[in-house]
């Protein structure tokens, strides 16, 4: 999915409160240098003691329409022998991001800002042990 300029019948930025209606240039500038990008790990999802998988979350009425989301592979963590450690838990690390969602009941190319919670990876934490008093 993509954003394209609003038609003439849609409200323009000048006619409304600036914060309610703004024009956004969606050309993405990759600010990461080649060196920084090449160091970005793509194998941590397998090497981690709390490994995860990635799924391609698609929503044509959202910008960006494609977001890769992490899910922990196991409830427990993986020890040095490759076995699940029942004293340690895999937990999802989530990040709140801003996305643009199309407002279908209005002009077809009118979008609103929405918050979205996205899983970015998993980490290993010790299980909570409750001692009987």
């Amino acid at each position: 999915a993509v954003l394209i300029p609003q038609s003439s019948v849609c409200p323009n930025a000048e006619a409304n409160n600036f914060l309610q209606n703004v024009k956004v240039n969606l050309k993405v500038i990759n600010s990461l240098s080649s060196k920084a990008s090449s160091r970005r790990p793509s194998d941590y999802l397998n090497r981690s003691t709390s490994p995860w998988t990635l799924s391609r979350n698609e929503d044509p009425d959202r910008y960006p329409s494609v977001i890769w989301e992490a899910q922990c592979r196991h409830q427990r963590c993986v020890n040095a022998e490759g076995k699940l450690d029942h004293h340690m838990n895999s937990v999802l690390i989530q990040q709140e991001i801003l996305v643009l969602k199309r407002e279908p009941e209005k002009c077809p190319f009118t979008f609103r800002v929405e918050k979205m919670l996205v899983g970015v990876g998993c980490t290993c934490v010790s299980s909570i042990v409750r001692h009987a008093s």
């Epitope: 999915a1 993509v2 394209i4 969606l26 993405v28 990759n30 990461l32 080649s34 990008s37 090449s38 970005r40 793509s42 194998d43 999802l45 397998n46 998988t53 990635l54 799924s55 391609r56 698609e58 044509p60 960006p64 329409s65 494609v66 890769w68 077809p108």
Partner: antibody
């Protein structure tokens, strides 16, 4: 200049596997998705799946989920598509193509790799 | 899966004339449609993205229109190098699908 260069033609027997490579140059390899598409002789194009070299994520067309494996090697900026349990109907030209995830379109394509499955 | 249906399968037009190629989606795909040109032995070449945006370096005689389920590729004045197969494709939702192609031949 962006270039996607694929490996050479392959001839395989039914039941075998084939691994096609696609080497990228002219841009940051980890920034964009790689999709794989095939075209049987005289036919249309069929989407196989996608890999994002930046995070290692993959997604597949259900028709290929059990037989196709997509991988990427960041050190050589190369994407791979492996297809197993080959049958005669897998004879096709296999293309890698770069997908601009934010913009939402395929811009550059490899030159294609002809895979022939014959006994 | 979304089915993309192109018509006609073959179109015979004389050089200098206008060619109009059609593509229909089995359900709404908004404007998430691309058009590709393919010549024998070559890879597909992107012409139009998002239904109506001409890709960098594509001549102005190529134009696209449509939204929802009906899309059109128009070549205003056919040049000898335009005779090829043209595919439409949707990237609205995966699995991304392509039309079967329209072969544009010299009349």
């Amino acid at each position: 200049e962006v270039q996607l260069v694929q490996s050479g033609a392959e001839v395989k027997k039914p039941g075998a596997s084939v691994k096609v490579s696609c080497k990228a140059s002219g841009y940051t390899f980890t920034d964009y998705e790689f999709h794989w598409v095939r075209q049987a002789p005289g036919q249309g194009l069929e989407w196989i799946g996608v890999i994002h070299p930046g995070n290692g994520g993959t997604a597949y067309n259900q028709n290929f989920r059990d037989r196709a494996t997509l991988t990427a090697d960041k050190s050589t900026s190369t994407a791979y598509m492996e297809l197993s349990s080959l049958r005669s109907e897998d004879t096709a030209v296999y293309y890698c193509t770069r997908f601009l995830t934010y913009e939402g379109y395929f811009d550059y394509w490899g030159q294609g790799t002809l895979v022939t499955v014959s006994s | 899966n979304i089915v993309m249906t192109q018509s006609p399968a073959t179109l015979s037009v004389s050089p200098g004339e206008r060619a109009t190629l059609s593509c229909k989606a089995s359900q709404s795909v908004s404007i998430d449609v691309g058009w590709f040109q393919q010549k024998p032995g070559q890879s597909p070449r992107l012409l139009i993205y998002h239904a109506s945006n001409r890709y960098t370096g594509v001549p102005a005689r190529f134009s696209g229109s449509g939204s929802g389920t009906d899309f059109t590729l128009t070549i205003s004045s056919l040049q000898p190098e335009d005779f090829a197969v043209y595919f439409c494709q949707q990237d609205y939702s995966s699995p991304y699908t392509f039309g079967q192609g329209t072969k544009l031949e010299i009349k």
